[in-house]
Amino acid sequence: TLNSVLNSNAIKNLPPPLGGAAGHPGSAVSAAPGILYPGGNKYQTIDNYQPYPCAEDEECGTDEYCASPTRGGDAGVQICLACRKRRKRCMRHAMCCPGNYCKNGICVSSDQNHFRGEIEETITESFGNDHSTLDGYSRRTTLSSKMYHTKGQEGSVCLRSSDCASGLCCARHFWSKICKPVLKEGQVCTKHRRKGSHGLEIFQRCYCGEGLSCRIQKDHHQASNSSRLHTCQRHHHHHHHHHH
């Protein structure tokens, strides 16, 4: 039961803070069933849509990526931007809309939508700007550096998934982001159905693990009009390998 009030502040277009709890819920992350705030939730006040600050693609929706809004802009001021459609220019897979990937600088079609989860930690620069957020943060902090030189365990506060130990991702929980286990085959995942819905989650699951993608559960015993449960499932054998 959600007995809380979530107030979405109007100052969402500020640059992301450095460190533990930056950004907002991410594309590679899904809400636990039943815990996604519905649009009409009586406990919630949602402002008119404003750009979300972010530090990496993971913090944006499935149809968004994280970048400076202007080419060559200040890498410290990044927001979630709408994904790029087929045949549009790109620099990495996350820039392309679901069902597409970045090949030779152009978004092209793919028959699988699992690149973002698998490559989220490979490239974090945007438009040629190197924003070593974590390094910059750990140099500035006065907390024990031990926190940042050892990979976060389950429940540790994190900024991005690369802060977490193997098999964990960085996902929102309450008012922080913490390391949680990456989902295994058969575990429930949730696909974001409407744009911006990821901004309402305060509990997130990780993305599906390597070789898995979040798909509708094929259950012949379920009635066709029943709720469509998504689970982590093995990729089809004919999928392409586009990772670099």
């Epitope: 039961t1 959600l2 007995n3 809380s4 009030v5 979530l6 107030n7 979405s8 502040n9 100052i11 969402k12 500020l14 992301p16 803070p17 450095l18 460190g19 533990g20 709890a21 930056a22 950004g23 907002h24 636990a32 979300y52 600050p53 943060y137 500035r140 902090t141 006065t142 907390l143 926190m147 389950e154 429940g155 540790s156 506060v157 996902a171 929980h173 309450f174 008012w175 922080s176 913490i178 949680k180 286990p181 305060i202 509990f203 699951r205 990780c206």
Partner: antibody, heavy 117, light 111 residues
């Protein structure tokens, strides 16, 4: 060293207002969620409010509409504006943050609020 | 909201003895592969201090004699050998759901 220092407590009449402050040091304040937790005399602990690093705010039903949590990252300060105070709001108010894990892992020493006529 | 019930309310023990404190949740506090149960110690006139988070992980600087176990709805805090400074009140707290809630506490006193 991480430090959280609360202030602003005192005696107030029912229906009155009070503003608590929490001065933080020893960590990059703007990055982390920070909360208020209270403890009535001789009683247990109760979560009062939280504000995330991305500036969303959260409250339980017991204080919703009466209390407002806010933060000033430039001043490394957290605030709790308490209006329409009731006798049952009498407590020690602690600010607490989650720096290394999701629990309340660092606490201030608390400030006492007494609501009485 | 999730209700946490701690037992016993008071535990009378001598230094060197083993203390076992229990916390039962009204519903499971497990999710995302984590048990969202924490334990705090509070001495008179002082702020609470985090001992254990995620059911069994030690907080920063916590002595090895403090350990946590359990999953689902039943959790245990164990102090393997009580030191004089361990006599205090201990609270469990869940972070699975909003609002986060605390148990009523267990007072560990000197026998």
């Amino acid at each position: 060293e991480v430090q959280l220092v609360e202030s602003g407590g005192g005696l107030v009449q029912p229906g009155g207002s009070l503003r608590l402050s929490c001065a933080a040091s020893g960590f990059t304040f703007s990055s982390y969620a920070i909360s208020w937790v209270r403890q009535a005399p001789g009683k247990g602990l109760e979560w009062v409010a939280s504000v995330s690093g991305w500036l969303d705010t959260y409250y339980p039903d017991s204080v919703k509409g009466r209390f407002t949590i806010s933060r000033d990252n430039a001043k490394n300060s957290l605030y709790l504006q308490m209006n329409s105070l009731r006798a049952e709001d009498t407590a020690v108010y602690y600010c607490a943050t989650s720096l290394q894990n999701y629990a309340f892992d660092y606490w201030g020493q608390g400030t006492t609020v007494t609501v009485s006529s | 909201e999730i209700v946490l019930t701690q037992s016993p309310a008071t535990l009378s023990l001598s230094p060197g003895e083993r203390a076992t404190l229990s916390c039962r949740a009204s519903e499971s506090v497990d999710d995302f592969g984590i048990s969202f149960m924490n334990w705090y110690q509070q001495k008179p006139g002082q702020a609470p201090r985090l001992l254990i988070y995620a059911a069994s992980k030690q907080g920063s600087g916590i002595p090895a004699r403090f350990s946590g176990s359990g999953s689902g709805t039943d959790f245990t805090l164990t102090i393997s050998s009580l030191e004089p400074e361990d006599f205090a009140v201990y609270y469990c707290q869940q972070s699975k759901e909003v609002p986060p809630t605390f148990g009523g506490g267990t007072k560990v006193e000197i026998k």
